[in-house]
């Protein structure tokens, strides 16, 4: 806390300049009228604070909205946002996304921070969905923002927002949350015909099942063995050895080299010995 | 619902075979789900596996133990064993039977029966 | 084989603890990652399958996260029967492999 002194004769402040970075604590607190601060936010970040400095313009704020900030201070907050915690956060209302992009700018390069967290979380909750353009936005400063979230959160992504993600966004997604996903995957994509209907949902297929990988077997879809790893156990299992050789196509040699790894190890252990040697690979169920 | 239990000797001399059977019952060793594990437990330290077996004989052993080990099943009986050759002192430990399910891992376990190896 | 790491191999909570434990692969092995639980002179008992998927009848306050090389057990609220062991174990590989153990004691 800084204490209450007055401002010295012909320091006040008339507006937010480079001269403020002369100023003391003190001299800020009692010299930069928190109204004015907040008129001319989108100048602090041109203007080379210290730490401590920037302590002080966000008391005066908290002290001028201690119910959180309106929308025109926190769109141009820049560097001052580092400063916030996700309790200052939580008081916020963030409805543009304009604003969310210009905070997440200031957090570019680095981890998803607490504060970043609840921000998103205030904006998507405040929106109802993960509407495409806002899914768009994170995913382009977050790639593993998508399987960040709860299969209860991807529940409220509308199939239309799909159309967003990139087959990179989906990388360290668990399988719960490609069973969350895929339907959606599915719906978006249905009116694709059959090659470009599967490069669109093969990042998708984790969460498929066993009668959608049957019926895109019967399509010469060539699915590579990266995307047949990470098929549901339960998925692949019913799969006859006819059916797996269709779907992988030229790749099927590729099941050699996974044979001790699941899912493909628990498809061979149960697979008849004679129809594994059709294969020619070597199998040994 | 489905229960294991380990039968078999509890002291075996060096160099002989470790013989021990695991029971089911109340479900299927020839469930298509799931594959039957031994896994062991030396006195105050962690957990090794050893093997498993599918009810249609097809069996999978821990590399640093397949030259000793034997799993074998026999679907009459509801039972699957475990045969350990030309045993010493460092395989002195506490076995478990498990069943592995295909979709979630070592779901039910047997009590465990501990073998000590002695002369 | 792969090796399996957990750490710490001990730690000391109280209850009403938020307890984490970490396990580390050698090699991404995907998803299929459990947690087992076991207490003196009693067979371990499945908690977590596949990394994130609480198994049937274990108490909510049990969650598991992560994929390919890390992943991570959480208890939020530790209880006075969670005082035990804790193994990971990867089922990727047909060679299973199980981590060290961490043993959580009451401090």
């Known amino acids: 806390e800084v204490e209450k002194t007055a401002c010295p004769s012909g320091k006040k402040a008339r507006e937010i300049d480079e001269s403020l970075i002369f100023y003391k604590k003190w001299e800020l607190e009692a010299c930069v009228d928190a109204a004015l601060l907040a008129t001319q936010m989108d100048r602090v970040n041109a203007i080379p604070f210290t730490y401590e400095q920037l302590d002080v313009l966000k008391h005066k704020l908290d002290e001028l909205y201690p119910q959180g900030y309106p929308e025109s201070v926190i769109q141009h907050l820049g560097y001052l946002f580092l400063k916030m915690s996700p309790e200052d956060i939580r008081k916020w209302n963030v409805t543009s996304l304009e604003t969310l992009k210009a905070l997440l700018e200031v957090n570019k390069g680095h981890e998803m921070s607490p504060q970043v967290a609840t921000l998103i979380d205030r904006f998507v909750k405040g929106r109802g969905q993960l509407d495409k353009d806002t899914l768009d936005t994170l995913t382009a400063f977050y790639p593993g923002y998508l399987c960040s979230l709860s299969p209860e959160e991807l529940s409220s992504v509308p199939p239309s927002s799909i159309w967003a993600v990139r087959p990179q966004d989906l990388d360290t997604c668990d399988p719960r949350q490609l069973d969350v996903l895929y339907p959606k995957a599915r719906l978006a994509f249905q009116n694709m015909n059959g090659s470009e209907y599967f490069v669109k949902i093969q990042s998708f297929l984790g969460g498929a099942p066993t009668e959608d990988l049957k019926a895109l077997s019967q399509q010469n879809v060539s699915m590579d063995l990266a995307t047949f790893m990470k098929l549901r156990t339960d998925a692949v299992l019913p799969l006859t050895v006819a059916e797996v050789q269709k779907l992988l196509g030229p790749h099927v040699e590729g099941l050699k080299a996974e044979e001790r790894h699941r899912p493909v190890r628990d498809w061979i252990l149960r697979q008849r010995q004679d129809d594994l040697d059709t294969l020619g690979l070597g199998l040994q169920g | 619902q489905v229960q294991l239990q380990e039968s078999g000797p509890g002291l075996v001399k060096p160099s002989e075979t470790l013989s021990l059977t695991c029971t089911v019952s109340g479900g299927s060793v020839s469930s298509f789900t799931d594959t039957w594990s031994w896994i062991r437990q030396p006195p105050g330290k962690g957990l090794e596996w050893i093997g498993y077996i599918y009810y249609s004989g097809s069996t999978n052993y821990n590399p640093s133990l397949k030259s000793r080990v034997t799993i074998s099943v026999d679907t009459s009986k509801n039972q699957f064993s475990l045969k350990l050759s030309s045993v010493t002192a460092a395989d002195t430990a506490v076995y478990y039977c498990a069943r592995d399910n295909v979709f979630t891992g070592f779901d039910i376990w047997g009590q465990g029966t501990m073998v000590t190896v002695s002369s | 084989d792969i090796q399996m790491t957990q750490s710490p191999s001990s730690l000391s909570a109280s209850v009403g603890d938020r307890v984490t434990i970490t396990c580390r692969a050698s090699?991404?092995?995907?998803?299929?990652l459990n947690w087992y639980q076991q207490k003196p002179g009693k067979a371990p008992k499945l908690l977590i399958y596949a990394a994130s998927s609480l198994q049937s009848g274990v108490p909510s306050r049990f969650s598991g996260s992560g994929s390919g090389t890390d992943f991570t057990l959480t208890i939020s609220s530790l209880q006075p029967e969670d005082f035990a062991t804790y193994y990971c174990q990867q089922s990727y590989d047909a060679s299973y492999t199980f981590g060290g153990g961490t043993k959580v004691e009451i401090k």
């Open positions: 090699q991404s092995i995907s998803s299929y």
